[in-house]
């Protein structure tokens, strides 16, 4: 990119550059028309018979350098061939010299700085590539010369350009003073500012475009070369912020349209809102959940919105004394999530009718909550109590929902309490064919013991056919018809109005081989 400091082709008024010395044959300003018939200014000089050592100087106005370190001067000029000038002496030249002088303000006058090399800095002696020939009475013919010179390095606020003629017949048709700069550039969503190169290459820090954020890694930079071109090199750039996507050839970040979102910064485009969510504004990084739908804290921002599950279905209960096995079917609606668990709430009602949350004597296997499988075993139920179990299904967003959690209830009433197991069986008398047994009366909570059932079988004789039962209303019994010298396993259970209690522990007893021995053994 070129930034013009001076272009005589664009000047509409007299240039009025300074000439030195004030003598005849000096540079003179002319006006004319360029190829587009626009008014332009030129300078001519043609003192081919000048005195030796006499130079004609022409100096531009003061040109602020505007931060440029190197300035380029493009000269368009024509040069008359010395041979075609009848009056030309040996002092006729076909070259001219270009100088510049730096200053911090427009301080030059008609006489200062001194019109010579040092203080003026010589740029170059310019020779014409194309010479114009002039025939008497005919128009001069010849090509225009174009020469670009480089001035600098410059350090002061501005400068003057000066032309020294020492015997040429020439016309300075135009002067274009400019400097080169790297144009503002946007690449990879990174904007690099317009930069005037101060050296061969200058590193330039980039900044992210609006709605973009720096990518990880070193901050983006690009090199501006002295020729005003950006050096080609990969740019670790920026990426569009959440809610924005790259557009217009990676030069802009465009807000996600309504109904779309982009959750993270980086590459990628806006996506339609996931299930059960919406975005009513542009530039959404996340879509809002519909009423009744939620995202768990651990859900990604781009995850669909989900809802708590419906209640479990078809709870089936199997009561076994003080134990209860509950199982159920999964809810019809999972809420769109995989992390389904179950939990139980429990209330117990006493026989008298007062109800309260279940006490700590109940145990749940595997537990009362966070159940992954649709079943539980409840132990420690108290007899003659009514239990209400509410089975709820939960998922990762249940805690976010307001309002009651749907549940499936089941009511279970336990039987009244049966007598406890009979233990401490004693053998009171033993013979080769019989055993007399006694035991302590168990404390039955729901009324007296009505009777007992004795269950026995010979040790080693397993199977239902070998088991015998005996009922007795007393807390003793005599087992007859037993084998001599045999071992027997005996269990006793008590019956009350609530029914039979459990059999006690098996008691090991043995019949006698003969009468006298048996009595001794038992007494011992």
């Amino acid at each position: 990119l070129e930034e013009t400091l001076l272009n005589t082709k664009l000047e509409t008024a007299d240039l009025k550059w300074v000439t030195f010395p004030q003598v005849d044959g000096q540079w003179e300003e002319l006006s004319g028309l360029d190829e587009e018939q626009h008014s332009v200014r030129t300078y001519e000089v043609c003192d081919v018979q000048r005195a030796p050592g006499q130079a004609h100087w022409l100096r531009t106005g003061w040109v602020p350098r505007r931060g440029a370190v190197h300035v380029y001067a493009t000269l368009r000029f024509t040069m008359l061939e010395c041979l075609s000038l009848p009056r030309a002496g040996r002092s006729c030249k076909e070259t001219f010299t270009v100088f510049y002088y730096e200053s911090d303000a427009d301080t030059a006058t008609a006489l200062t700085p001194a019109w010579m090399e040092n203080p003026y800095i010589k740029v170059d002696t310019v020779a014409a590539e194309h010479l114009t020939r002039k025939r008497p009475g005919a128009e001069a013919t010849g090509k225009v010369n174009v020469k670009t010179l480089r001035l600098g390095p410059l350090s002061k606020a501005g400068f003057y350009l000066a032309f020294q003629d020492q015997g040429a017949c020439m016309a300075l048709l135009s002067l274009h003073l400019f400097y080169k700069k790297c144009a503002q550039l946007t690449v990879n969503l990174t904007r690099f500012p317009e930069t005037v190169p101060r050296e061969l290459v200058v590193p330039v820090a980039g900044s992210c475009v609006v709605d973009a954020v720096p990518a990880p890694g070193p901050s983006p930079s690009l090199y501006c070369r002295e020729d005003g071109q950006w050096a080609e090199q990969p740019v670790t750039g920026c990426s569009c912020a959440p809610g924005f996507e790259a557009a217009e050839g990676n030069t802009k970040c465009r807000a996600c349209a309504q109904g779309t979102f982009k959750p993270l910064s980086g590459e990628g485009s806006c996506q339609p809102c996931p299930a059960n969510s919406h975005s009513n504004t542009i530039g959404s990084a996340v879509c809002q959940c519909r009423v009744g739908y939620f995202r768990a804290r651990t859900d990604p921002r781009g995850a669909p919105c989900t809802t708590p599950p419906s209640a479990p279905r078809s709870v089936v209960s199997r009561l076994n004394g003080s134990s209860l096995h509950l199982e159920w079917s999964a809810p019809l609606e999972s809420g769109g999530r995989e992390d389904l668990t179950y939990a139980l709430r429990c209330r117990e009602c006493r026989p008298g009718g007062s109800c309260a949350p279940c006490g700590g004597d109940l145990t749940f296997d595997p537990g009362p909550r966070d159940l992954v499988e649709p079943w539980v075993v409840v132990r420690g139920l108290r007899p003659d109590f009514t239990y209400t179990f509410e089975v709820t299904a939960l998922n990762g967003v249940s805690s976010l929902a307001t309002g009651p959690v749907p549940f499936e209830p089941v009511n279970v009433t336990t039987d009244r309490e049966v007598p406890p197991a009979v233990s401490d069986i004693r053998v009171t008398r033993s013979s080769p064919s019989s055993l007399s047994l006694a035991w302590a009366v168990p404390r039955a909570p729901s009324g007296a013991v009505l009777d007992y059932e004795v269950k026995y079988h010979e040790k080693g004789a397993e199977g239902p056919s070998s088991v015998r039962f005996l009922k007795t209303s007393e807390n003793r019994a005599e087992l007859r018809g037993l084998k001599r010298g045999a071992s027997y396993l005996v269990q006793v259970r008590a019956r009350s109005e609530a029914g039979y209690g459990p059999f006690g522990q098996e008691h090991h007893s043995q019949t006698q081989l003969d009468e006298s021995e048996g009595w001794r053994e038992q007494l011992a």
Epitope: T12, A13, D14, K16, Q22, E28, E29, L30, S31, G32, L33, Q37, S39, T42, E44, C46, T78, L80, T132, K134, G137, E139, A140, C169, A171
Partner: antibody
Framework: QVQLVESGGGLVQPGGSLRLSCAAS????????MSWVRQAPGKGLEWVSN????????HYADSVKGRFTISRDNSKNTLYLQMNSLRAEDTAVYYC???????????????????WGQGTLVTVSS | DIELTQPPSVSVAPGQTARISCSGD??????VHWYQQKPGQAPVLVIY???KRPSGIPERFSGSNSGNTATLTISGTQAEDEADYYC???????????FGGGTKLTVL
């Protein structure tokens, strides 16, 4: 001898037309930009029109634009001013003038008039 | 376009210095040319490019231009210098030429 000689002036009625001529001699006419300048009786000088050496461009004062036409015939070394729709305020001495010439480039000219004719009187009256 | 203003008349005793001014906005940024016109004659260029003198013009004629004013100076004025003097400049961009109203110089 370097000179410019105007002719064609005279008395003309308002709305009438007149054509002035300016014969050039003693210099390379086809390299010169030429102009007409007029001077009303007892008044100052007023520039009227310019023409480039090759007739590629003409310029006019606002007061005559659309009514006057400047032209030249380089083969005859002659400059012309065709005046139509003449008005009383056009009454003046009309001078033909040469603009300062370039050494060798007829596309350019200096901004002063370095050679004048003796003038020709145009009277617009009924 | 630029407007050039001259005093209608200036008087000077023979041998004295006559100064004729020509003013206009930022005139110093333009080149000013001066013409002498004697009664019944065509104008003659006496100063061009602010201060240059054409060949044949006496050295007593000089010119300057800065700020808003250009000045034609005739030092050691002679009776033959009595004439009307006109300043002229180039109208920016349009190739239109602009003249001042003229100043009658009387040599007393």
């Amino acid at each position: 001898q370097v000179q410019l000689v105007e002719s064609g002036g005279g008395l003309v009625q308002p709305g009438g037309s007149l054509r002035l001529s300016c014969a050039a001699s003693g210099f390379t006419f086809n390299n010169a930009w030429m102009s007409w300048v007029r001077q009303a009786p007892g008044k100052g000088l007023e520039w009227v029109s310019n023409i480039t050496s090759s007739s590629s461009m003409t310029h006019y004062a606002d007061s005559v634009k659309g009514r006057f036409t400047i032209s030249r015939d380089n083969s005859k070394n002659t400059l012309y001013l065709q005046m139509n729709s003449l008005r009383a305020e056009d009454t003046a001495v009309y001078y033909c003038a040469r603009k300062g010439m370039s050494f060798y480039n007829n596309k350019y000219a200096k901004s002063m008039f370095d050679l004048w004719g003796q003038g020709t009187l145009v009277t617009v009256s009924s | 376009d630029i407007e050039l203003t001259q005093p209608p008349s200036v008087s000077v005793a023979p041998g004295q210095t006559a100064r004729i001014s020509c003013s206009g906005d930022n005139l110093g940024k333009k080149y000013v040319h001066w013409y002498q016109q004697k009664p019944g004659q065509a104008p003659v260029l006496v100063i061009y490019y602010d201060s240059k003198r054409p060949s044949g013009i006496p050295e007593r004629f000089s010119g300057s231009n800065s700020g808003n004013t250009a000045t034609l100076t005739i030092s050691g004025t002679q009776a033959e210098d009595e004439a009307d003097y006109y300043c002229q400049a180039w109208g920016a961009g349009s190739h239109q030429m602009v003249f001042g109203g003229g100043t009658k110089l009387t040599v007393l």
